[in-house]
């Protein structure tokens, strides 16, 4: 058993049929010694008396809010949560496996630049009685500070018959050094509590590996004289690190119709302009990637050809 | 050329070669990005490699103030990785294809280090750790980790030279 926060405790249980469970001793936070009784949740049934209460925690029915009283007055509470371990593996029932970029990916994180600011998100089908708490650091043995905000519900989607909820959190490294080569990864830890179930999820990454620039901005087309060719130009996204002579991007320019199966024109360039062939009912799209490190491409920025 | 005395390097040449290094580092092991090597207990390998750190003057302001600190750090790293790529880790079994990008990568690391430090001038170089994996699978894992780390190192070096070529070239 360990303390998650004040008056909230996590009991770690090996979860299998007829498991013996864990013996837990609760102590009432009071100077009183006599006349103390214990109850669980809303029940008035007295579970025991005395300053301590010893219980055998085997299942969710044994978890919950234990309260010690004296003469009708509440002295203190202890909330017991369960953390299940099945076949040596901690349960991951609360969050959905996003399966990208690999199986068992519960947390996904992205950064728009090298400033040390990043966003992580996760998915669940649970809509109520759900809380998250996020901590982060650079490195684990001698951790350097990363400050994370509160996790918030950022999107709701209907997937087949059930709803899916996306939560996200923004974090900022306290003393970021955008130009340095990272040697210690960022660690992100998410505590998830659903009713009386506790689970924790972690992710470890370098900012450089989660970079995904915003799409290029200000796409403009200039038809070339006596030709079907068009000069397309664009600018670096505002959110990208500066100066651009140092933090350079490379671009992919594509001309395509509505369907992915349609014929297309495509060219890669380090410049902020390119010449392509425009067709009626097609769109010109441009996306960006770090020039020197193969992290994710941005989403496409698009303008119609006509 | 960047010599210990403090003259300027051939920024444009360094830019071209460092960008080539980036391409080669990813070609040498493109799939390394799909392996989570941190799960494999990284400490003994990548803690020993020279990283370009915050105080090394490789940020735009530091380069403007005095590029020598940064160039010396990059030079150290190039020599370090050049030695690693020429070591038993890469020459031993399982043997690399004769024409694998690792060969070009090795040559280009040497080429860039010589652009930065001509013959006869000497900057301090970092000792290479004695990493001699006994099993081929250990060697393979070590190669992945070294290349992964090299990808990050050459990305910073390429940014430095691109910025230098754009803003510090005479």
């Amino acid at each position: 058993i360990w303390e998650l926060k004040k008056d909230v405790y996590v009991v770690e249980l090996d979860w299998y049929p007829d498991a013996p469970g864990e013996m837990v001793v609760l102590t009432c936070d009071t100077p009183e010694e006599d006349g103390i009784t214990w109850t669980l949740d809303q029940s008035s049934e007295v579970l025991g008396s005395g300053k301590t209460l010893t219980i055998q925690v085997k299942e969710f029915g044994d978890a919950g809010q234990y309260t010690c009283h004296k003469g009708g007055e509440v002295l203190s509470h202890s909330l017991l949560l369960l953390h299940k371990k099945e076949d040596g593996i901690w349960s991951t029932d609360i969050l959905k496996d996003q399966k990208e970029p690999k199986n068992k990916t519960f947390l996904r994180c992205e950064a728009k630049n090298y400033s040390g600011r990043f966003t992580c998100w996760w998915l669940t089908t649970i809509s109520t009685d759900l809380t998250f708490s996020v901590k982060s650091s650079r490195g684990s043995s001698d951790p350097q500070g990363v400050t994370c905000g509160a996790a918030t519900l950022s999107a709701e989607r209907v997937r087949g018959d059930n709803k899916e909820y996306e939560y996200s959190v923004e974090c900022q490294e306290d003393s970021a050094c955008p130009a340095a080569e990272e040697s210690l990864p960022i660690e992100v830890m998410v505590d998830a509590v659903h009713k009386l179930k506790y689970e924790n999820y972690t992710s470890s990454f370098f900012i450089r590996d989660i970079i995904k620039p915003d799409p290029p901005k200000n796409l403009q087309l200039k038809p070339l004289k006596n030709s079907r060719q068009v000069e397309v130009s664009w600018e670096y996204p505002d959110t990208w690190s500066t100066p651009h002579s140092y933090f350079s991007l490379t671009f992919c320019v594509q001309v395509q119709g509505k369907s992915k199966r349609e014929k297309k024109d495509r060219v890669f360039t380090d410049k902020t302009s390119a010449t392509v062939i425009c067709r009626k009912n097609a769109s010109i799209s441009v996306r960006a990637q770090d020039r020197y490190y193969s992290s994710s491409w941005s989403e496409w920025a698009s303008v119609p050809c006509s | 050329r960047a010599v210990p005395g403090g003259s300027s390097p051939a920024w444009t040449q360094c830019q071209q070669l460092s960008q080539k290094l980036c391409t080669l580092a990813w070609s040498a092991h493109p799939l390394v990005g799909h392996m989570d090597l941190r799960e494999e207990g990284d400490e003994e390998t990548t803690n020993d490699v020279p990283h370009i750190q915050c105080g090394d003057g490789c940020d735009p302001q530091g380069l403007r103030d005095n590029s020598q600190f940064c160039l010396q750090r990059i030079h150290q790293g190039l020599i370090f990785y050049e030695k690693l790529l020429g070591s038993d880790i890469f020459t031993g079994e399982p043997s690399l294809l004769p024409d694998s990008p690792v060969g070009q990568l090795h040559a280009s690391l040497l080429g860039l280090s010589q652009l930065l430090q001509p013959e006869g001038h000497h900057w301090e170089t970092q000792q290479i750790p004695s990493l001699s994996p006994s099993q081929p699978w250990q060697r393979l894992l070590l190669r992945f980790k070294i290349l992964r780390s090299l990808q990050a190192f050459v990305a910073v070096a390429a940014r430095v030279f691109a910025h230098g070529a754009a803003t510090l070239s005479p």
Epitope: K263, V267, F268, I277 | -
Partner: antibody, heavy 118, light 107 residues
Framework: EVQLQQSGADLVRSGASIKLSCTAS????????MHWVKQRPEQGLEWIGW????????EYAPKFQGKATMTADTSSNTAYLQLSSLTSEDTAVYYC???????????WGAGTTVTVSS | DIVLTQSPATLSVTPGDSVSLSCRAS??????LHWYQQKSHESPRLLIK???QSISGIPSRFSGYGSGTDFTLSINSVETEDFGRYFC?????????FGAGTKLELK
């Protein structure tokens, strides 16, 4: 299966014109760009130009402007290359290509050998 | 026009050897470079697109890398069916141009 059937080899006199055909099967040429590429005996490849059969748009390499004319007939699913004022320099194999992407050549015809005699 | 220089002009190898073919552009072309194989009396066929992207149906022994001005096509353990000519082609700007080719022949 995507295939391109090119017209047979031809021997033509210097100064004459010739029209080569390239008929597609297994796909509709409107969904592709059609390119023509020239290869002289024991030599490299030269790009002549492309046509978008959907709208008739064409683009020629400067070297072939005035020498080559590309057309397409979507009803017969065929692209054509007409070469005029032939000289010995035009003796070559001419390949047609069908391309989903404009700038590289993924489906090649077998080629038509054109020999110009004086 | 962008000029592509291929080297060597001829490469004599034994089946089982691994080889690298080089293509150098007269100016930077990012990764807009494609490789073709042409066997004797056959049409060319696309091997690699955009410097390193593989093409379905092409054996995995063919790989490409490079960007800017220097590009390489590698054949890991040459097989007898690989003999022929190899061309690079740039798609960075019009007109599209090809290299003069490298002939891969039996030693």
């Amino acid at each position: 299966e995507v295939q391109l059937q090119q017209s047979g080899a031809d021997l033509v006199r210097s100064g004459a014109s010739i029209k080569l055909s390239c008929t597609a099967s297994g796909f509709n040429i409107k969904d592709y760009y059609m390119h023509w590429v020239k290869q002289r005996p024991e030599q490299g490849l030269e790009w002549i130009g492309w046509i978008d059969p959907e709208n008739g748009d064409t683009e020629y390499a400067p070297k072939f402007q005035g020498k080559a004319t590309m057309t397409a007939d979507t009803s017969s699913n065929t692209a054509y290359l007409q070469l005029s004022s032939l000289t010995s320099e035009d003796t070559a194999v001419y390949y047609c290509n069908a391309c989903k992407e404009l700038r590289y050549f993924d489906v090649w015809g077998a080629g038509t050998t054109v020999t110009v005699s004086s | 026009d962008i000029v592509l220089t291929q080297s060597p002009a001829t490469l004599s190898v034994t089946p089982g050897d691994s080889v690298s073919l080089s293509c150098r552009a007269s100016q930077s072309i990012s990764i807009n470079l494609h490789w073709y194989q042409q066997k004797s009396h056959e049409s060319p066929r696309l091997l690699i697109k955009f410097a390193s992207q593989s093409i379905s149906g092409i054996p995995s022994r063919f790989s490409g890398y490079g960007s800017g001005t220097d590009f390489t096509l590698s054949i890991n353990s040459v097989e007898t069916e690989d003999f022929g000519r190899y061309f690079c082609q740039q798609s960075n700007s019009w007109p599209l141009t090809f290299g003069a080719g490298t002939k891969l022949e039996l030693k």
